[in-house]
């Protein structure tokens, strides 16, 4: 059988010789060089060699445990001259014993940590780790403790664990940020003689809300003239914050003042500046001066620091409005005049009236914006605003009339406003009645009297208020012995009777029928219109067959024995 | 590298003996076995004995016991094998090899033997 | 003694085809996972080559087409493919225990 225990190796061995690691033996050999004594497994015949004949093994180079700890190897002693092994083949171990030869080294060469300003005192801030090669399992060669180097009283470290925590109360971020801390792990537990490491901790303090914002001045002017639509930006104001951030973040508002009303402030989120703006339309007439207070806060407080005071400030704001020279205002956005149609040139319709708003009150000339009145219909009085005609009028060719009228300060032509004057032109019975078409209609041979034969219908282009009456009546001239008669409807339209039964077309083959059509209107408007009446041989169911191509016309108009 | 020279031939009468020779070069001589092989012509091949020449130590097929005597000459890196009454049963090619954990690596090119009157 | 049979007392193969020797011993040649069974090939006028040792080690400088297996009692030497110099007489060899035995050859010819 195999006659050895464990080996063990010192690390880092630095004689000149081989290290003699131990000896293999089987109680086989009779030390006659008859067997021979195999190595393989980790590092056989390169970092371990042995002697064939006696089993004697040897390292050949330094070993760090810290690389490899332990090396597996299989032992095999075999007769020389046949082969045959004489134990089985075995397994043992080399173990490398630990010296302190490696200092503790930190996860990371700097840290970077951050803690809130302000914190108490023993606030976690980081925890530091440094590891030793070195055997945990044997002495303190891998045993560390933590100390602090450099960033006393500001911060301490826990020996055992590395945890960084604050030593000293109210460290202020306004007053300092960054803090480089140093912090040494030392092995053999602390000890002389330990070998040591350190690290850099690079501490930030990050931001608190324990400043108010503040104004740094009380009182500000801003000027805006009286023409500033509402929206206007009149000024700026900054109150400052010493926190960063969200601690920083700034509201604005206005709190009282006349001005309260007329004017907004708003917060520039990106300059954390107030913007006054103009609320209400500004009147320098009616106000100069306005005071407002505006307030700054921080939206986002801390409860823990509200002993400190309110976290808000305010100032006062002066805003003086500036006289801006205006142009006249008319009395009325627009005016809706109204005019008979038979006005004579120079009637007066209506007037316009414009002011100068300013102090000054400066005196207005009008005129009409002949863009608007081409054709010179109109005209004004430049002085009083009075609105006449300078045209006749035709309600039937134009129903209103639009223009422009321009009111100009007479001392600064640059100042001028317009207003749009509508004009309505109302109806005057000036146009008489007349047939709807031309009437041409037939009778036939064999018609009895009485018999309707057309149906007369009027139009007239005036508009009368109580709507359009028409009566229709034969002219004077061929009422007495006429072929037909004329029966008014009373609905506007009238109907054309024949007087007799029948009629002979060679003997009168067309008549001439004037009308007399009259409206009911004031002054009353009438004309007379001629119908054309064929005499024609109609079928038994009275459709006409034939007429005569053209009627005999009389230079009257008139036929005879109509 | 290794090499086992044997002379090429040996012709003896019946009855005589003959001490064959085999030299060694290339390794370390008195550290490995030597091994003698008979093979007779046209046969399959017999282990005869071996030798340590480091100690002259030596273990032999039984059936070779009264008819081979190894021996060895460390100064000359030579081994040798003595056959006695010969007979032309013991005409055949003999060879001598290294045996190496067993196995005969390396062989030399073999002394034929004839035994005839 | 451990008697050695080899089988077939010789074979012809094609070329490029696989060969197939066995040997089987009278008794066990193998101890601790050692076997002690040995494999040589002879060409005429020449001596025996090692081309195989401890049942399945290549020795150096023989080609990889030659392997062999086998353990206890019964091993086998594999050609694969088989080329033109691999025509020879092929015998196996134990080292278990004195006296060394060899098998009776197995002729290889190739087709």
């Known amino acids: 059988s195999w006659m050895w225990n464990q080996f063990f190796l010192l690390e880092e061995y630095t004689g000149s010789d081989y290290q003699y690691v131990g000896k293999l033996h089987s109680d086989q050999d009779r030390g006659d060089g008859s067997l021979k004594y195999i190595l393989s497994g980790d590092g056989a015949g390169d970092l371990f060699i042995i002697n064939e004949n006696t089993g004697d093994i040897q390292a050949t180079k330094r070993l760090d445990r810290e690389e490899k700890p332990v090396y597996i190897l299989r032992a095999q002693a075999i007769n020389r001259r046949t082969g045959r092994p004489v134990e089985p083949e075995s397994e043992f171990i080399i173990k490398i014993h630990d010296i302190n030869d490696n200092e503790p080294i930190f996860t990371k060469e700097v840290y970077t940590a951050t803690v809130p300003e302000m914190s108490d005192v023993g606030t976690f801030v980081v925890q530091v780790t440094a590891t030793d090669a070195d055997d945990p399992t044997y002495g303190n060669s891998a045993k560390v403790v933590y100390s602090i180097l450099q960033g006393q009283p500001y911060f301490s470290v826990e020996s055992e664990t590395g945890i960084i925590k604050t030593a000293l109360l109210n460290m202020d971020r306004e007053n300092r940020e960054q803090y480089q801390v140093v912090i040494q792990a030392k092995d053999m537990g602390g000890q002389m003689g330990g070998l040591s490491g350190t690290t850099t901790v690079n501490i930030t303090l990050t931001d608190v809300n324990d400043n108010p914002p503040r104004f740094p001045q009380s009182t500000y002017q801003f000027k805006t003239p009286e023409s500033s639509p509402p929206g206007t930006p009149i000024g700026r104001i900054k109150a400052s914050d010493a926190d960063v951030g969200e601690n920083a973040e700034i509201e604005y508002s206005i709190t009282d003042g006349e001005g309260l009303d007329m004017f907004d402030v708003i917060t520039d989120q990106e300059t954390q500046e107030g913007i006054i703006t103009v609320k209400k339309l500004l009147d320098f007439e009616k106000k100069k001066v306005y005071t407002l207070k505006v307030e700054a806060s921080n939206p986002y407080v801390e409860p823990r620091f509200l002993y400190l005071g309110p976290f808000k400030d305010s100032a006062t704001v002066r805003i003086v409005v500036e006289d801006v020279d205006e142009p006249p205002v008319f009395s009325k956005l627009a005016y809706i005049l109204q005019i008979r149609e038979d006005a004579q040139i120079n009637t007066t319709i209506g007037s316009v009236t414009a002011q100068d708003p300013d102090a000054a009150r400066n005196p207005v000339k009008y005129s009409v914006d002949r863009h608007t009145d081409m054709d010179r219909i109109f005209n004004i009085d430049s002085g009083n605003g009075s609105i006449f005609t300078s045209k006749l009028l035709d309600r039937e060719t134009l129903l209103w009339h639009n223009i422009t009228v321009i009111a100009t300060e007479i001392n600064n032509p640059k100042q001028s406003s317009r207003v749009p004057l509508y004009i309505k032109v109302l109806d005057v019975n000036d146009n008489a009645p007349e047939f709807a078409e031309f009437y041409e209609t037939f009778v036939c041979e064999k018609a009895k009297a009485d018999q309707l034969i057309q149906t007369l219908h009027a139009v007239d282009k005036d508009d009368p208020y109580s709507g359009h009456q028409f009566s229709f009546s034969l002219a004077p001239e061929a009422a007495s012995g006429s072929n037909f008669t004329i029966q008014d409807n009373k609905d506007n339209t009238a109907g054309i009777l024949t007087r007799k039964n029948g009629y002979n077309r060679h003997e009168m083959s067309t008549y001439l029928l004037p009308v007399v059509i009259s409206d009911n209107d004031y002054p009353v408007q009438s004309s007379t219109g001629t119908v054309t009446v064929r005499v024609c041989a109609c079928d038994h169911h009275g459709n006409m067959q034939s007429c005569h191509a053209e009627a005999l016309i009389h230079p009257t108009g008139l036929s005879t024995g109509a | 590298q290794v090499q086992l020279q044997q002379p090429g031939a040996e012709l003896v009468k019946p009855g005589t003996s003959v001490k064959m020779s085999c030299k060694a070069s290339?390794?370390?001589?008195?550290?490995?076995?030597i091994a003698w092989v008979k093979q007779r012509p046209g046969q399959g091949l017999e282990w005869i004995g071996d030798i340590y020449p480091g100690s002259g130590r030596t273990h032999n097929n039984e059936k070779f016991n009264f008819k081979a005597t190894l021996t060895v000459d460390t100064s000359s890196n030579t081994a040798y094998m003595q056959l006695s009454s010969l007979t032309s049963e013991d005409s055949a090619v003999y060879f001598c090899a290294r045996p190496m954990l067993g196995r005969f690596d390396y062989w030399g090119q073999g002394t034929t033997l004839t035994v005839s009157s | 003694d451990i008697v050695l049979t080899q089988s077939p007392a010789s074979l012809a193969v094609s070329l490029g085809q696989r060969a197939t020797i066995s040997c089987r011993a009278s008794?066990?040649?193998?101890?601790?996972?050692?076997?002690?069974m040995h494999w040589y090939q002879q060409k005429p006028g020449q001596p025996p080559k090692l081309l195989i040792y401890a049942a399945s080690n290549l020795e150096s400088g023989v080609p990889a087409r030659f392997s062999g297996s086998g353990s206890e009692t019964d091993f086998t030497l594999n050609i694969h493919p088989v080329e033109e110099e691999d025509a020879a007489t092929y015998f196996c060899?134990?080292?278990?225990?004195?006296?060394?035995?060899f098998g009776s050859g197995t002729k290889l010819e190739i087709k």
């Open positions: 008794e066990s040649v193998s101890i601790h996972g050692t076997h002690l």
């Open positions: 290339g390794y370390t001589f008195t550290s490995d076995w």
């Open positions: 060899q134990q080292s278990f225990e004195d006296p060394f035995t």
